[in-house]
Every structure is written in C-alpha cells, then in structure tokens.
C-alpha cells in the first residue's frame, strides 16, 4: 500500500489505513454524475460500519451564486452547475443517533459520528487502490486557538475595589431539549478573503468546493438543533480585500459587518455571513455577535483558516455561528453534550455536538423573537441546494414542499408527491396563508415592534408578508432625545431598562467619563490587539454604558460581573457579561445612540450623525403626514394614502401592503 | 376532453333566491377544484366562490359569505351555486371554471377549462 506523504498525516497522532467498498453498483471511475444515494463498508479501529449516504438536497441549487473580482475590480457574478453535487448526509447502519457529512467528490472525504467517537476520513494521497485515512478527530492535533480571551483569562484579570457582589440571582429552569419542535433555516453567506484565496493556489474551484463541503458539515453538525444550514452565497474577495483586516479580531469584525450590511445584504437577501480569513488574531479563531442572527447590522462572524483541516474549522465556524444564534460559551455553565468538550466551549476545541445550554440558549433566542428570519423555508432562487421535491425546501419549479409522505398527510395544501398546491390551494405556507388560503389584503402580518418600526400587511394575492422595512435611519424619536437606527429608538434610558430591569435610567455624563476612562473590562471604548482601550472625554458616552436606580439584577442565562462605582452623589453600574473576547459586549452602548447634539455612536466614537445619511424632508416629501422609512419611501399615518401622503387614505406605504381591506374593516390596525 | 354548461341564470328580483349549476360532461373532475366567477359590464372577471370535487373544501370571496353556498352532487357531474338575497350588483355573466393546478383563485390562466357562461341580471 502507498505509505502517507508526511504533509497528509503530520496533524494525526493516530491514523488507520483503509479501502472502503462500495455496495450500491461497481465503484464509478468517471466522476459524474454522482449517485442520488450510495452506500459503502468502512473499517475502523478493527470493526466494519456499513454507511448509507444520501445527497444533501437542502444544501445547494440551480443557480448557486459566486461573486469574485476581475482584476480591475469589478464584480462578476457567476452561477456554476453544480446540481449533481457529490456532498452526502448519512448515518451508520445500527449505531443510534449516528451521523455522517461526506464528500464523495475525489474518494470519500468528511466526518463520521458514531455514539461516543468522531472520526474524519479522506483519500490516501497518491494512493491508485482507493485507499484511504481514518483517524479519531481526538487525534487530531490542535492550535490551542480560542474564542478570544477564555473565560478563565478574564477571571485572572485584576477584581475591581468598587466590583460588589450581586443580588442572588434567579436560576433559569432548565429544560433539558435537544431538537427544537420547528425547523429553522440559516439561510447563510460565506466570503473567503484574498490570502486564503491565495492560499488556495487562486483556484476559485478548489474554494467553492472546499466551502461547500464546510456548509455540508455545518448542516450535519447543526441538524441535531432541528437547524439546517443552507448556502445561499458565497464571494471571494480574488483581487484584494474589501475592507481593512490589519488590527485586533473586533475592529474586523466591525469592518466586516459595515461592509455587509453597505454592499452584501443588497445583493443577496441572507441570515448570517461569515468571513473566512487566513490570518490569525493570536491564538483567537473566531469573533462573533450574539444573538444578532436577524439583524441587518450584526448578522456577521469572522473565522481563522490557517494551516488546519475543514474538518477542524467546521467547528469554529460552527461556533461563531453559534453565538450569532444566541449561543453563548459552555464554560463555568452545567452543560452536557455526550462528549468532552462541546462546540460552544470557549476553547475552540474541534468538538461536533452542541450542548443542552445551546439548545436553551436559541430557544430563548427563539421566544424573544430574535429568530423571525430563520422561520421562513428558503425561496427557490435563493437556495443552493439541488431542487428535489420532499426536502421540505421549496426549490425552484416547486410550489410547496411539506416532506415525507407521512410529513405530507398532515398539509391539507400540498400535494406530497409533486410538490405542486392542491388544485383547490392558493397557498401552502407563509405568513399570509391560512387553510390554504391567501390571508385578506390589509391583514397585518408584521407588527410595529417599536416607534421606529412601521407595520407591514398582506397584499391579498400573496402568501408572503412585504418584506420588513423601518422608520429611516437618523429620524428623531422619543421626543427629539434619540435617534433611529435599524427600527429601534436608541436612547440611554431604555438599553438601562433591557438590562436592569424597567425602573433603571442612563447615569449622568460624569459616570461615563469616569468609568470609561479607564480602559478596563468594565469601562473601555472597545478591544484593540489584546487591550482596552481608554474613551476619550468626547467619546466617553459611546463606551460602557452606565446606569442608576438600579432595582433589578439581570439573567440571560449566563451570570455577568456587575460594577457599582460611586461618582458625585449617585451610584453608577455597570456590567460585563464575561462572554470572551469573541463576542461583543452587551454591556456597551449601541450603535446609533444619541451622544451629543446632532452627533451618534459608531464604533465607540461619538461622531456627526450625518454618517447615518438622513436625508428625508418629511414636510416636502411626505407633506407632513408621514415619515420616510429604509426604503426612503413616505410611510403616512391612517388618514392619508401613500406615496405622498398628500390625498386621504387609510395610511401605509408603497411598501407596506394595503392597509386596509375594503369588506372587513375589522382587519384595520 | 372536458365540456362546462352552465344553467340557471336569468332575470330575477332583488332579494329573491336563485340556483346556477354547472353540469361537466367528457372527463373525470377527480382532484379538480370547480369555481364560479362573474364578469359585469366593462369590469373583469372575478371568483366568487370554489369547491374540490374530491373534498369539503370550500371558499368564497368576502363580499357573498353567507349568501351564497356552494355544492356538488358527482353523481350528476354537477357544481351549484346557491344564491339567496341577490342584489342589483349581482348582476353579471356568470362563469363556471374547473382547474387542476393551485394558486390564487384570480389567477385566471390557471383554470383548464371553462363554460359559456349564464346572463343573470337583478332588478331593484
């Protein structure tokens, strides 16, 4: 047998050398097309596992699309064919809750979980008699890279004089659940930057390929949360990055999100992106928002990709995604996941399985409603997966999906084995369908969530809700005290409230100044390399945030740190939740808060408002009977009719839906 | 190949009842969904109520809910339209449909096949 190049097992400890045999038809030689379904014996560690594949039909589709750059810089869109993909999802016939991601492109590449042990396989290198490796993914060797700063790094920091202890806190009831009851789709984007891309020998296949095969493992890692993963996107930044990666993991992070939500979102409608970098930030793998999965602003992750696996950096990529999903660390928590270590310990430890706090902590993403966007099946154009009627994705061609035939015999809307709407349906699922039926024009079907927000309704001829839009950036809320920003009112007040509980208020200036000043884990204007940094005078207000007539101790499922430090008369508190230098803290004042006349936070600075774009004159525009929403459009109060709000109407906008229904007025707002 | 006839329709008072059928003949209406729907002058063509012929389900537009009621008898190959209390703005070709395909039931390219249409004018 052809003995392993040096460079092919030098990460291993321990490896076997095996010939897989495949039982469905003679092994093909050509290539394509790829069998639907394939089943082959495996040895490992002296047993025979017979593995049964299927294609992975929710991953990919007709018109996957991949952006990249010419050399002048301008974007080419491209939409490669790969509906016969060779990515495979399976299991091992008699092991329980066993699961397989297998690539069966070039020989058999990928994981293979059984019930207490993880094994990665791939092709012998230079092997002519389908040879392959099988390892242990315990033996596999590790950078010790982390999440950023581990917990226990933040806990040897030096304890504050004036840190007290907190109230005793309420503990959350757990319950313990590994599925959730309804499948939720991250409808995700990947973007490889220029050194991977350079990495990877500038071979924009070679990148497809490999970041279809991590979307693959994605989907089987995160496919016990009853979560599917599917790529609706991918851009390789071919000619130079697009934004600036010199600095610490959180001022890429930053860039990264602005970027996205500047030239991304517009392009390709998405739930979270994450950027695959080469460069490392000093031992961190990865930085990500927490709980930000929806947000048109925070959706966003960035991972390392250096000189290890797609095996391994599935896990890391899997763990920031986590925490965009409201997933915070495993550590110091009563977490159990039947392994040693699971994804969302803050060492990025290579683990497959999530723990049962993963699972409470997107369920308690889920209840707050931070996860509307993954309810709704990914439409046909914006799903890579292979069209294929029953994966419960409705694909292009089709028209509803409702699964199995057993699946399929509690939708009285679709027809199971076509994929096609009964001929009596008009729709089968979406927010404006009911019992098959379009819901009424003017039914509301996504509610003003805050006075920032705007209603959106049914049209009457459709089963999806418009799509959701908001007040304007930079429009005045709260009586001229705050501003807009992404449909919430940003104001002190109310960021005190959500974390101290309703009676709390914004601590005077001087509190700022002075606990930010000291560029320290409770008062900082933000992480740069692996320091604090202090908050100038003017910036103060943009750093931690402070707050008084604090009543009540928060508890979102993970125990923060909470400071009191006394300044002129008052007590001003504030907190760090300790999530590791991974995820940004939300302790901090948000983006888009009001810090001075006519003047915002952004990235920690206290800058011109006029940063936000605000350009609409409400008295010209909407003749002083609306606002303008995100789409610049006038949204006008009941009484007027859009587009201008200049003759009656029953309110709303071009872009709300009708605001009324003609023979029920009951449906009225 | 399907053939639709309508029947029923003429000129009538308001608030009087009055029964359309619609009678297929030439095919199997299994899994069909049969609509009637009606055209004024110079207006377009609207749904006003459907049934499955294979199911109880029924559906009607907003504005005759619990005026008119639709039916079907397979044995006679038959959809009815059980109009009570019809109005001046009833007045219209009535038109029955049958289709195989789902969708909005405006949608009337959807419909495979269709009959001639019945006059039904309503005096005040």
């Known amino acids: 047998a052809a003995r392993p190049g040096f460079q092919q097992t030098s990460h291993l400890s321990s490896y076997e050398i095996i010939t897989p045999w495949r039982l469905t038809r003679e092994r093909r030689e050509a290539p394509r097309p790829y069998s639907k379904q394939v089943s082959y014996v495996i040895q490992a560690e002296g047993k025979e596992h017979i593995i049964h594949l299927e294609r992975n039909k929710d991953l990919l589709p007709e018109d996957f699309v991949v952006y990249t750059y010419n050399k002048e810089g301008t974007l080419i869109t491209d939409h490669p064919n790969i509906q016969n993909h060779c990515h495979y999802r399976g299991y091992v016939e008699g092991v329980h809750n066993s699961s397989i991601a297998l690539s069966d492109c070039f020989g058999l590449r990928g994981l293979l979980h059984l019930e207490n042990a993880s094994y990665g396989i791939e092709p012998l290198q230079n092997s002519s008699h389908f040879e392959h490796i099988i390892y242990r993914m315990d033996d596999v060797y590790k950078e010790p890279l982390k999440c950023g700063v581990s917990n226990k790094d933040i806990e040897k920091e030096t304890a504050k004089d004036e840190e007290e202890e907190p109230p005793s806190m309420t503990q959350l009831l757990r319950r313990r659940r590994a599925v959730l009851p309804q499948t939720r789709y991250v409808e995700l984007f990947i973007v490889v930057d220029k050194e991977r891309y350079d990495m990877m020998g500038r071979n924009q296949t070679a990148v497809r390929e490999e970041m279809i095969l991590l979307a693959n493992y994605l989907d089987s890692m995160y496919i016990m949360l009853n979560i599917r993963i599917v790529l609706v996107g991918l851009e390789i930044w071919t000619n130079g990055n697009l934004i600036n990666i010199v600095g610490g993991a959180g001022d890429v992070l930053g860039n990264f999100v602005q970027w996205r939500e500047k030239f991304l979102i517009t392009r390709r409608r998405h739930d979270s992106a994450q950027l695959v970098l080469k460069k490392g930030f000093g031992g961190t793998a990865g930085m990500a928002f927490v709980g930000t999965v929806c947000s048109r602003s925070h959706a966003g992750g960035i991972n390392v990709f250096g000189q290890i696996t797609v095996e391994t950096f599935a896990s890391i990529v899997a763990h920031e995604l986590g925490h965009n999903l409201g997933m915070n660390h495993d550590d110091g928590r009563d977490c159990s996941c039947g392994a040693k270590s699971c994804i969302m310990n803050s060492g990025a430890s290579g683990s497959r399985n999530f723990s049962s706090c993963s699972a409470e902590d997107f369920e308690k993403l889920t209840l707050n409603k931070g996860g509307n966007c993954l309810l709704n099946i990914p439409k046909p154009d914006e799903a890579y997966s292979a069209p294929s009627c029953g994966n419960k994705l409705v694909d292009a061609g089709e028209e509803c999906d409702c699964g199995t035939p057993k699946e399929c015999e509690l939708d009285p809307c679709c027809e199971g084995s076509t994929c096609k709407l009964k001929s009596f349906a008009e729709c089968a699922y979406g927010d404006c369908c009911k019992d098959c039926r379009f819901l009424p024009g003017g039914t509301l079907c996504r509610g003003k969530t805050s006075e920032c927000d705007v209603p959106e309704y049914c049209n009457g001829s459709s089963q999806f809700c418009q799509p959701d839009v908001f007040i304007q950036n930079g429009y005045p809320c709260q009586n001229n005290k705050a501003y807009c920003y992404n449909g919430m009112c940003q104001y002190y007040d109310a960021q005190c409230q959500v974390i101290f509980g309703s009676k709390a208020k914004a601590a005077p200036k001087d509190c700022f100044i002075e606990v930010n000043s000291k560029g320290d884990r409770f008062g900082n204007c933000g992480f740069s390399g692996n320091e604090y940094k202090k908050c100038a005078t003017g910036n103060a207000l943009c750093g931690k945030l402070q707050c008084e007539n604090v009543q009540e101790i928060p508890v979102f499922g993970i125990v923060p740190a909470i400071i009191q430090t006394p300044s002129r008369g008052t007590k001003c508190w504030g907190v760090d939740f300790q999530l590791g230098s991974d995820v940004p803290d939300p302790g901090m004042v948000n983006e888009g808060t009001k810090c001075g006349a006519g003047k915002i936070c952004r990235n920690f600075q206290c800058v011109d408002a006029s940063v936000l774009n605000y350009d609409c004159d409400v008295q010209k525009k909407c003749h002083g009977h609306g606002v303008c929403n995100s789409n610049k459009n006038c949204h006008c109060e009941n009484g007027w009719a859009p587009p201008n709000c200049e003759t009656k109407g029953y309110g709303g906008s071009v872009d709300s839906g009708p605001t009324y229904n003609e023979m029920n007025t009951a449906l009225r707002d | 190949e399907v053939q639709l006839v309508e029947s029923g329709g003429g000129l009538v008072q308001a608030g009087i009842s009055l029964k359309l059928s619609c009678t297929a003949s030439?095919?199997?209406?299994?899994?069909?969904?049969m609509g009637w729907f009606r055209q004024a002058p110079g207006k377009e063509r609207e749904f006003v109520a459907g049934?499955?012929?294979?199911?109880?389900?029924?559906a009607y537009t907003d504005s005759v809910k619990g005026r008119f009621t639709i039916s079907r008898d397979n044995a006679k190959n038959t959809v009815y339209l059980q109009m009570n209390d019809v109005k001046p703005e009833d007045t219209a070709v009535w038109y029955c449909?049958?289709?195989?395909?789902?969708?909005?039931?405006?949608?009337?390219?959807?419909?495979?096949?269709w009959g001639q249409g019945t006059q039904v004018t309503v005096s005040s």
């Open positions: 449909a049958a289709r195989r395909r789902g969708g909005g039931y405006n949608q009337l390219n959807l419909y495979d096949y």
């Open positions: 030439g095919g199997t209406l299994t899994n069909y969904f």
């Open positions: 049934v499955a012929w294979s199911s109880d389900f029924t």
